[in-house]
Every structure is written in C-alpha cells, then in structure tokens.
C-alpha cells in the first residue's frame, strides 16, 4: 500500500512539476524591468525566452518575438535548450510512469517490469527537474551579471547634459515558477525511485522450504518472491510469508501436498 501511495504521489508531484516547467518556459516574465531606484516610467518592460514585451500604462501591451536564431545570446539559447530537454524528458517520463503505476493493470505485466519502468521514469523526472533548475539558474545568473553592469553606468551621460535612462532587469515570475517546478519534478522523481525499490524487493539467498503444520495450511516460502502484477488470475486474499517479511504485493497461491522442495 505504501509503495503504491509513494508511486502515485511521485507521479502527481512530477506531473505538477512538469506542468510548471512548461508554464515557465512559455511565460514572458523571465526578466522584468527593475522599478527600484529608477526613474518612474509610463512603460513596463519584460522579457521571456521567446519574446519581449512592453506594457504601456495606458493599458496597451505589445510583444515582439525574437525572430533571429543566430543573433541571440548563447546563454539564452542554452537556457532554451535546457528547458526543452527538461520538458521532453519529463513528458516521456510521464508516459512511462503511467504504464508503471501499480494501480493500472496492463495485460499481465510483471512487477519487475513495472519496477524497471518506475525507476526509468524516476530517473527521467530527476534529470528533467535538474535541467529546469539549471536553465532557470543560468538565466538568473545572466540577469545578476547584467544588473550590476547596468548599475555601474545607470545613466550614460551624453555631452554632460543629456541623460539616457538605462533599463535594468530583475528576476521575473517565470524564474520562481521554474525553480519550484524543477524542484517538484526532482522530488517526484526521487519518490518514483523509492517506490521502485518497494516494487522489487531484493531476493534472499536461502532456499525455499515449505512446511505443513497440522491443521493449518499456511505456506512458508522464504525468498520465493516472484515479480508480477497484483492483478493476476489468482486474487484470493491468502497470506504468504517471505522469509519472515510480509509483502502485500505478491500473487497468492494455495498450498498443496506437493509443496515440498
């Protein structure tokens, strides 16, 4: 039960995280005009990975896409790449994890296969989350560097008389969305990896021996774990004891008089 819950929760957390990564990637507010210690302007500038926007106080907003590829800074291209890789890995991870969920029965898929798929999706989520966090962090670092550079020459004097307003940019909402989303995807991935361990416990090395107690038919099968779905044809709720460790995720079988090894 705990394994199923962990797996399900991991899936949900990762799903929210990946939705957040997609949202962050599409958002226009990666960097926003810094309003502190700046002349108050009647326009507000903000920029995303794909376009830059200007919102006039009068209510009009105009956005222009970056229609060049080669003219863009390498760092911006790197951030785009990281976010897209994160989304792609996350999407594949989600697809894999859907089939890996214990609560979903797909034919006669064994627990070992589900465990492998859970681990695969978990790793994908972890890498996806790391990509998003890395992408957002690279962009944030770029902003900080540019911020202090523009602060150093806040006003560019021209002829000693005329002043040019330097627009400084600070962290936009998308950065925080990206960090949180990346973190959630990472946590979801870790949870999937933990769930994978519960789905496929390690086999013990001692030989399986079956004892018949008089009057009671209870099979003792140490180390006799067989990976399978919880949805086999035999779903009678009998107990099996595996080397003293009880697992709820195994296929139950009736003891018979031929159970001796």
């Amino acid at each position: 039960m705990a394994v199923t819950a962990c797996q399900g929760l991991g899936f949900v957390v990762s799903l929210i995280g990946i939705a957040g990564i997609i949202a962050a990637t599409c958002m226009d507010q990666w960097s926003t005009q810094d309003l502190y210690n700046n002349p108050v302007t009647a326009v507000f500038n903000y920029q995303g990975l794909w376009r830059s926007c200007v919102r006039e106080s009068s209510g009009f907003t105009e956005c222009r896409g970056y229609f060049t590829l080669l003219g863009l800074p390498a760092m911006l291209q790197a951030v785009r790449a990281l976010m897209i890789v994160g989304i792609v890995l996350g999407a594949i991870g989600l697809l894999v994890s859907i089939f890996a969920l214990k609560c979903i029965r797909i034919g006669s898929m064994e627990d070992s296969a589900k465990a492998n798929m859970t681990l695969t999706s978990g790793i994908m989520f972890i890498v996806s989350g790391l990509c998003a966090i890395a992408g957002v962090s690279v962009f944030a670092n770029m902003l900080v560097t540019n911020f202090w550079m523009s602060t150093a020459n806040m006003y560019t004097g021209m002829g000693g008389m005329v002043q040019t307003v330097q627009t400084r940019y600070t962290f936009g909402a998308a950065l925080f969305v990206g960090w949180v989303a990346g973190g959630l995807t990472l946590i979801g991935g870790v949870m999937m990896c933990i769930a994978c361990r519960g789905l496929a416990p390690e086999e013990t090395n001692y030989k399986a021996v079956s004892y018949h107690a008089s009057g009671h038919s209870v099979a003792y099968k140490p180390g006799g774990f067989k990976a399978s779905t919880g949805f086999g044809s035999n779903t009678k709720n009998k107990k099996i004891y595996d080397g003293g460790a009880r697992t709820e995720d195994e296929v139950q079988s009736y003891p018979s008089k031929h159970d001796y090894v």
Partner: antibody
C-alpha cells in the same frame, strides 16, 4: 464612441479647494486611464496628473502636495481636487484618455476655472 | 523632471510652404524594450481642445493628413508639415510620454502670412 466631459464650479475663491469631475463614456475606467491637463489663459499646456486603470496615480512634481485624483469606476467618473488655490491656478482644465504610446487620443472640451475673490 | 524645449516659439509661413519645428528633451525618451520613442505631438487650434497628431515620435494618429510627419530619436525630435494649409494654423505641442511627470513643451505657434 469615446467621450469625456468635465464639469467644474467656474469661479473659486483663493485658498479654497477646486473639485472637477470628468464623466466618461465609451470606455471602461477599470481598463483605461484618465489624464488631467490645464491651460492658463494665453499660455501653454501643463500636465497635472494621471490615474491609470489599475488605480495608480502620478502627479506633477510641483503640484503633488495640492493635487489629488481619484475615480469611481461604477459611475465612470474621475475626480480632480486642487487645494489651496491661488490666482495662477486660473485655467481651462481638460481631462483626456491616454491611448497607444500613452498619448491622449481623446480630450474633453475643457472647463474654465477662475480663481478670484 | 524632464524639460521639453520647443523651437521656434512661433513661425510665420505661407500656404504650401514646408515647415519644420523642433522639440528637445533633457532625457532620452527611447524605451529600450521596444525601441520606441515616447514622444507625442498635439495640435491645438484657437478655442479648441488639443488634438493628437503623432505618437511614438513618428506614428500618425488615424485621420491625420499625411503631410504631418514626425521624426527623431532619443532627445531630438522634429515635426514636419510638408505643405502648410490654412487649417494648420494652430499651436503645436510636444509631450514626454515616457518618464513621470509627463511634461509638455512650451509650444510652437504656426501663423500664416
């Protein structure tokens, strides 16, 4: 069709307060702002202040202590209040709607205010 | 505050003549975000409310005749009337629509001979 109409007292005594109402139609005050401009007789235009759709206000720095702009979105009205009037506050007061480029694309016909005892 | 300086303060021209008037601002009105200059030109005829002619320094308002042209960038701007008509007799104002307070220039009065 966008329209703005100012209504004021016409004559105000010095040191008193001036209250002018700008009633708008054809656009919503929740989305668009309203600017106030005045013009003393025979002189140029002087920007007084603005109230934007989100309710934020900005004022002429020399008049900030005497000016206040507020609005009633439901009644489509914007109010300009000028305190401690002096004779040089005698002017025609205009309200206008800022559009693209924050430029005032629509203006009221103006209301003439004389400050005199 | 940004100081807007218009020159000349008055112009006397004959119909059909080309006219240029200048507007200078003490700070740049160029917004780096969209590379647009937030300078506006208004026309005010005697006894009337001002009328918007040009915004973003060079974009004509709809319904404004194409003989009116705005140009310039940063701090230096120009309004040109390619062929002055009798109905163009008015005062022309420039306004900073970028940095608060949104100050006006002193105006250029256009008179006909």
């Amino acid at each position: 069709q966008v329209q703005l109409k100012e209504s004021g007292p016409g004559l105000v005594a010095p040191s008193q307060s001036l209250a002018i109402t700008c009633t708008v139609s054809g656009f919503s005050l929740t989305t668009y702002g309203v600017s106030w401009v005045r013009q003393p007789p025979g002189k140029g235009l002087e920007w007084l202040g603005v109230i934007w759709g989100d309710g934020s206000t900005h004022y002429h720095s020399a008049l900030i202590s005497r000016l206040s702009i507020r609005k009633d979105n439901s009644k489509s009205q914007v109010f300009l209040k000028v305190n401690s009037l002096q004779t040089d506050d005698t002017a025609t007061y205009y309200c206008g709607k800022p559009g693209r480029g924050n430029a005032m694309d629509y203006w009221g016909q103006g209301t003439s205010v004389t400050v005199s005892s | 505050d940004i100081v807007m300086t218009q020159s000349p303060s008055s112009l006397t021209v004959t119909a059909g003549e080309k006219v240029t008037m200048s507007c200078k601002s003490s700070q740049s009105l160029l917004n780096s975000g969209n590379q647009k200059n937030y300078l506006t030109w208004y026309q005010q005829k005697p006894g009337q409310s001002p009328k918007l002619l040009i915004y973003w320094a060079s974009t004509r308002e709809s319904g404004v005749p194409d003989r009116f042209t705005g140009s310039g960038s940063g701090t230096d701007f120009t309004l040109t009337i390619s062929s002055v008509q009798a109905e163009d007799l008015a005062v022309y104002y420039c306004q900073n629509d970028y940095i608060y307070p949104l100050t006006f220039g002193g105006g250029t009065t256009l008179e006909l001979k």
